[in-house]
């Protein structure tokens, strides 16, 4: 049913879904703090622009009686239940900031007449791609896939002179929500990644992964996995690894690699870590004081969601345009806005663009060093360290198939 929106006459409300099931196990209080900090900034920006309006947020909590797994497995119905609650209360804002779980976002998008914008901190899966009124403020699986294909094909870097066309993917089903959907996208037989590779096998058991490390008959030297260094160590331990194995560890939302006192453990020497470029320090902000570095991106996405709404509200109000229109609902894309931590760019489909950073472990310093950056907005790689002190022979990445000559 069409729900009236509290979104006119100088008063603009944001509906924030506070779901028990979330992409990251973040206390809801921290997300509330992030939203409130965002509101303060938006009010200031609107006031500076001479727009005398009220902007508030309504936090919608689910009862937590039925949907209490805490992760995303039971989120599908929770999102719809919350929407029903909003509908019954006739209490819809101008924008919905909410579901971070792919399941819930997909279902809500499918089952509702969305004439309002939806902003998500998460919704990583391919099933949430190309949704006309959905904006995602954390890197979705599609962006990861495009990086991997770009990197696999690259053969003109001083340290990578072979194109790759094969890979193993380790996916054992215990992954975090972001990793689950990243690996799911790589596994999907119809995905861009699968389409571009000649050989790809998913390893589902620890033993399969461990065996590949020294298997002379392996079909690829490259293994993609997702998680942090500790996750890799639990799996790999101190086992010997063939000299031409390359492990790509996807760990996007973890900026510990950039901290000054961090030393790379020995088991990371055959590993390239893919992460996001670190933001400016958020430690001084009130909302982030209690956050671990890995959770900061999630809370920041909520905060940036508020700032994005403020940005769009300002534009529409300055142009004298109505907020409760399909035009407003479809406007949250193909733009750059001033985020909490600097400019944030959204692509044509409302997905955040970012700079991914590929790190290696220097055999000289035992530090993580930047090998290259990749701009998801233009799908381009920028090599940073042309003479990396790799563990691999001749300080070059090996071919993906042992014994195959130059490509």
């Amino acid at each position: 049913s069409q729900v009236s929106q509290n979104c006119h006459n100088g008063s603009y409300e944001i509906s924030v879904l506070m779901m028990g099931n979330s992409a990251f196990a973040e206390p809801l209080k921290n997300l509330e703090d992030a939203v409130n900090e965002g509101l303060e900034i938006v009010r200031g920006r609107l006031q500076n622009a001479g727009l005398n309006v009220t902007v508030n947020a309504t936090f919608m909590y689910s009862d937590g009686l039925i949907h209490n797994s805490g992760d995303c497995r039971s989120s599908t119905c929770e999102g719809l239940d919350l929407l029903r609650k909003i509908s019954n209360a006739q209490r819809m804002g101008c924008v919905l900031i909410g579901p971070s779980c792919t399941y819930s976002t997909f279902q809500m998008y499918l089952d509702t007449e969305l004439s309002y914008p939806m902003i998500s901190a998460g919704s990583f899966g391919l099933s949430c791609d190309y949704k006309e009124t959905l904006t995602r403020l954390m890197s979705p699986a599609r962006k990861l896939m495009y990086f991997l294909v770009n990197f696999w094909k690259t053969n003109d870097l001083p340290f990578k002179t072979y194109s790759w066309s094969t890979s193993y993917v380790y996916k054992n089903g215990t992954e975090t929500e972001d990793c689950f959907w990243y690996l799911n996208a790589l596994e999907a037989s119809v995905s861009y990644f699968s389409h571009e590779l000649g050989f790809k096998v998913v390893l589902r058991q620890d033993k399969e992964f461990q065996d590949i490390l020294m298997d002379h008959n392996r079909k690829s030297n490259v293994i993609i996995m997702c998680g942090g260094p500790e996750f890799l160590y639990k799996l790999k331990g101190d086992r010997a690894v063939a000299e031409d194995i390359v492990i790509i560890l996807v760990d996007l939302f973890n900026d510990q690699y950039f901290e000054d006192n961090v030393t790379a453990p020995d088991y990371m020497k055959n590993v390239l870590v893919l992460t996001l470029s670190p933001g400016n320090s958020l430690l001084n902000s009130s909302f982030s004081r209690n956050l671990s570095p890995t959770k900061r991106d999630f809370a920041l996405a909520y905060l940036n969601g508020i700032l994005l709404f403020g940005h769009m509200l300002k534009i529409f109000l300055e142009n004298g345009e109505n907020i409760t229109t399909p035009k407003f609902a479809h406007a949250f894309r193909n733009l750059t806005f001033e985020g909490y931590d600097g400019p944030v760019t959204l692509d044509d489909w409302g997905d955040v663009d970012s700079t991914m950073v590929l790190l290696y472990t220097s055999v000289d310093t035992k530090k993580y060093k930047v090998l290259l950056t990749y701009d998801t907005h233009v799908n381009k790689t920028y090599p940073v360290d042309m003479s990396p002190t790799f563990t691999w022979k001749n300080s070059k990445l090996p071919n993906d198939i042992t014994g195959r000559g130059p490509q």
Epitope: D156, P158, S277, P278, T336, G342, P343, T345, T355, V357, V370, T373, Y374, D375, H377, V378, K380, Y382, P383, V384, M386, S387
Partner: antibody, heavy 118, light 110 residues
């Protein structure tokens, strides 16, 4: 399309420092590098150094090591080049330029003429 | 060495082809694909004409082409036109993580 905006001119005394800004408008500094290149009157181009703003990584030409500092402010999409202990031979137009690939500068600022004179 | 060597001047008649050379070492021009060419008209900002040895950015005329042999890169301008009269500089990435520019070549259209 991104443009790099620089101030027009600066006049400095020998021994002093100059800090030239370079602001990206119509886009962000993104993940590319920003290089600084100078050109003395009637002379060729001389590379001074570069920064990858998103990471704060810098490289400087040997000739300017210790005298030049390149920084960037991601939040304002602005890069800066500070040159200290100025002498008359530092009189030049100072350009900032975006490296879309190493040593491949596809977008240039208009240049800032720095005149060092007592 | 912190500069790449170019001829001071090259000239040609309209419609002719000319080639400008840029000589370095195996630590710069010969060692990496990161060799570029720039055109600069008097009082103007340099313009990227070729990058990665032989790649033309969009909007650059296909009369401009780049190549490399050993430690020497070359820029060829075919079908020379009056507007091609300008200074041309090569640049290269170097193993010391720096960039070098060439000494510059003045192209005159006779």
């Amino acid at each position: 399309e991104v443009q790099l905006v620089q101030p027009g001119a600066e006049v400095k005394k020998p021994g002093s420092s100059v800090k030239v800004s370079c602001k990206a408008s119509g886009g962000t500094l993104s993940s590319y590098a920003i290089s600084w290149v100078r050109q003395a009157p009637g002379q060729g181009l001389e590379w001074m150094g570069r920064i990858i703003p998103i990471l704060g990584i810098t490289n400087y030409a040997q000739k300017f090591q210790g005298r030049v500092t390149i920084t960037a402010d991601k939040s304002t999409s602005t890069a800066y080049m500070e040159l200290s202990s100025l002498r008359s031979e530092d009189t030049a137009v100072y350009f900032c330029a975006r490296d879309q690939r190493p040593a491949s500068m596809d977008v240039w600022g208009q240049g800032t003429l720095v005149t060092v004179s007592s | 060495q912190s500069e790449l060597t170019q001829p001071a001047s090259v000239s040609g008649s309209p419609g002719q082809s000319i080639t400008i050379s840029c000589t370095g070492t195996s630590s710069d021009v010969g060692g990496y694909i990161y060799v570029s060419w720039y055109q600069q008209h008097p009082g103007k900002v340099p313009k990227l004409m070729i990058h990665d040895v032989s790649h033309r950015p969009s909007g650059v005329s296909n009369r401009f082409s780049g190549s490399r042999s050993g430690n020497t890169a070359s820029l060829t301008i075919s079908g020379l036109q009056a507007e091609d009269e300008a200074d041309y500089f090569c640049s290269s990435y170097t193993s010391s993580n720096n960039y070098y520019f060439g000494t510059g070549t003045k192209v005159t259209v006779l």
